[in-house]
């Protein structure tokens, strides 16, 4: 149940995909990844107001309980709904190889 | 890659399963759910310090970039890794039915 995509907080303030440029040094991968030296990391950032992109029933419950008990129950959180795969070129004991990752780059986002 | 389960912030402070008692009124379900009148909602609450229960490579990246750019990149968030199903007894147009929900109660938690 992917709920409303209208952000009541104003354009770009709610949960959505952002791109953050990161070097291998930033990621702590410099000693084992050869290429690329820079990754355009797509990640999910933004607020999750009531029913905005609610991933499922649990997210809807969380919204209701957060409204009632904000000190106990946190608001839903903006996280990846799916991922884009990526291939990195890595150093190995035997030389250089392609290493595939299915869960590295966010593809789209929801609130949960 | 499910990383360390030791919480550096002290017992019970990090991402874990909590149970929150909620009435149908709390959940906004009073007009369509007949039973149960009260739900023991299991949800994921707590901090996600560096590499604690990191769900995948994306969570590890997020930790690294949050450390570098805390104003831009949020810390990973404590969310369900899986769910327990639940059956509710509902009012329908034709009477009363059992309705199964697969995504209502968190079963275990991770950081993403």
């Amino acid at each position: 149940a992917r709920n409303g995509d209208h952000c009541p907080l104003g354009p770009g303030r709610c949960c959505r995909l952002h791109t953050v440029r990161a070097s291998l040094e930033d990621l702590g991968w410099a000693d084992w990844v050869l290429s690329p030296r820079e990754v355009q990391v797509t990640m999910c950032i933004g607020a999750c107001p009531s029913q905005f992109r609610a991933a499922n029933m649990h997210a809807q419950i969380k919204t209701s309980l957060h409204r009632l008990k904000p000190d106990t129950v946190p608001a839903p959180c903006c996280v990846p709904a799916s991922y884009n795969p990526m291939v990195l070129i890595q150093k190995t004991d035997t030389g250089v190889s392609l290493q595939t990752y299915d869960d590295l780059l966010a593809k789209d986002c929801h609130c949960i | 890659a499910r990383n360390g389960d030791h919480c550096p912030l002290g017992p019970g402070r990090c991402c874990r399963l909590h149970t929150v008692r909620a009435s149908l009124e709390d959940l906004g379900w009073a007009d369509w759910v007949l039973s149960p009148r009260e739900v023991q909602v299991t949800m994921c609450i707590g901090a996600c310090p560096s590499q604690f229960r990191a769900a995948n490579m994306h969570a590890q990246i997020k930790t690294s970039l949050h450390r570098l750019k805390p104003d831009t990149v949020p810390a990973p968030c404590c969310v369900p890794a899986s769910y327990n199903p639940m059956v509710l007894i509902q009012k329908t147009d034709t009477g009363v039915s059992l309705q199964t929900y697969d995504d209502l109660l968190a079963k275990d938690c991770h950081c993403i």
Partner: antibody, heavy 120, light 107 residues
Framework: QVQLVQSGAEVKKPGATVKVSCKAS????????IHWVRQAPGQGLEWMGW????????VYAQKLQGRVTMTTDTSTSTAYMELRSLRSDDTAVYYC?????????????WGQGTLVTVSS | DIQMTQSPSSVSASVGDRVTITCRAS??????LAWYQQKPGKAPKLLIY???SLQSGVPSRFSGSGSGTDFTLTISSLQPEDFATYYC?????????FGGGTKVEIK
């Protein structure tokens, strides 16, 4: 925008050596590796190898091992492919291609190609 | 090495037609397949990576699907500028290998 510009056509005799250049612009040269691919007249595409400008690490196709050398010059953002002991079946268009930003084993954008003709 | 087999080797079609090209890998490559378009005298152009992800700037009439060993490139409504040769390429392991190509010709 990202651009790869290759050196001009070459005619070589069997046994000679050719060195093709590929000048990159529009991005940080040592952030992405360069692949080399060739295409014989009327034929399909054949991957030759890969080099990362950052460290100089290379991977070569086994059939070319010992005859091919890939290098880079970071000061001029240029990649080079040298092929030795040329034979007539090395006649081909030689392409350089950058790793795609999304995944290192997809190729794009590409250079315009360099025709190398091996003939006695 | 992983062998890539493309079919058909050529296809005759008209503007507006739906065209499907298939590519089979000799062993499982998960989703690590790319598709390229090449016009005569020009360099190949990346259309699709990771089996189904459309490269930026590529028209949405191109789509890719498949995983494991069997993959498909579909052009939903062929345009005049789409007459070209199409290649698949596996990106799961070195050496990278290409299919033999499929020439899309005007009927």
């Amino acid at each position: 925008q990202v651009q790869l510009v290759q050196s001009g056509a070459e005619v070589k005799k069997p046994g000679a050596t050719v060195k093709v250049s590929c000048k990159a612009s529009g991005y940080t040269f040592d952030s992405y590796g360069i692949h080399w691919v060739r295409q014989a007249p009327g034929q399909g595409l054949e991957w030759m190898g890969w080099i990362t400008a950052y460290s100089g690490d290379t991977v070569y196709a086994q059939k070319l091992q010992g005859r091919v050398t890939m290098t880079t010059d970071t000061s001029t953002s240029t990649a080079y492919m040298e092929l030795r002991s040329l034979r007539s079946d090395d006649t081909a268009v030689y392409y350089c291609a950058r790793e795609s930003g999304q995944t290192s084993s997809a190729l794009g954008p590409w250079g315009q190609g360099t025709l190398v003709t091996v003939s006695s | 090495d992983i062998q890539m087999t493309q079919s058909p080797s050529s296809v005759s079609a008209s503007v507006g037609d739906r065209v499907t090209i298939t590519c089979r890998a000799s062993q499982g490559i998960s989703r690590w397949l790319a598709w390229y378009q090449q016009k005569p005298g020009k360099a190949p152009k990346l259309l699709i990576y990771a089996a189904s992800s459309l490269q930026s700037g590529v028209p949405s009439r191109f789509s890719g699907s498949g995983s494991g060993t069997d993959f498909t490139l579909t052009i939903s409504s062929l345009q005049p500028e789409d007459f070209a040769t199409y290649y698949c390429q596996q990106g799961a392991s070195f050496p990278l290998t290409f299919g033999g190509g499929t020439k899309v010709e005007i009927k």
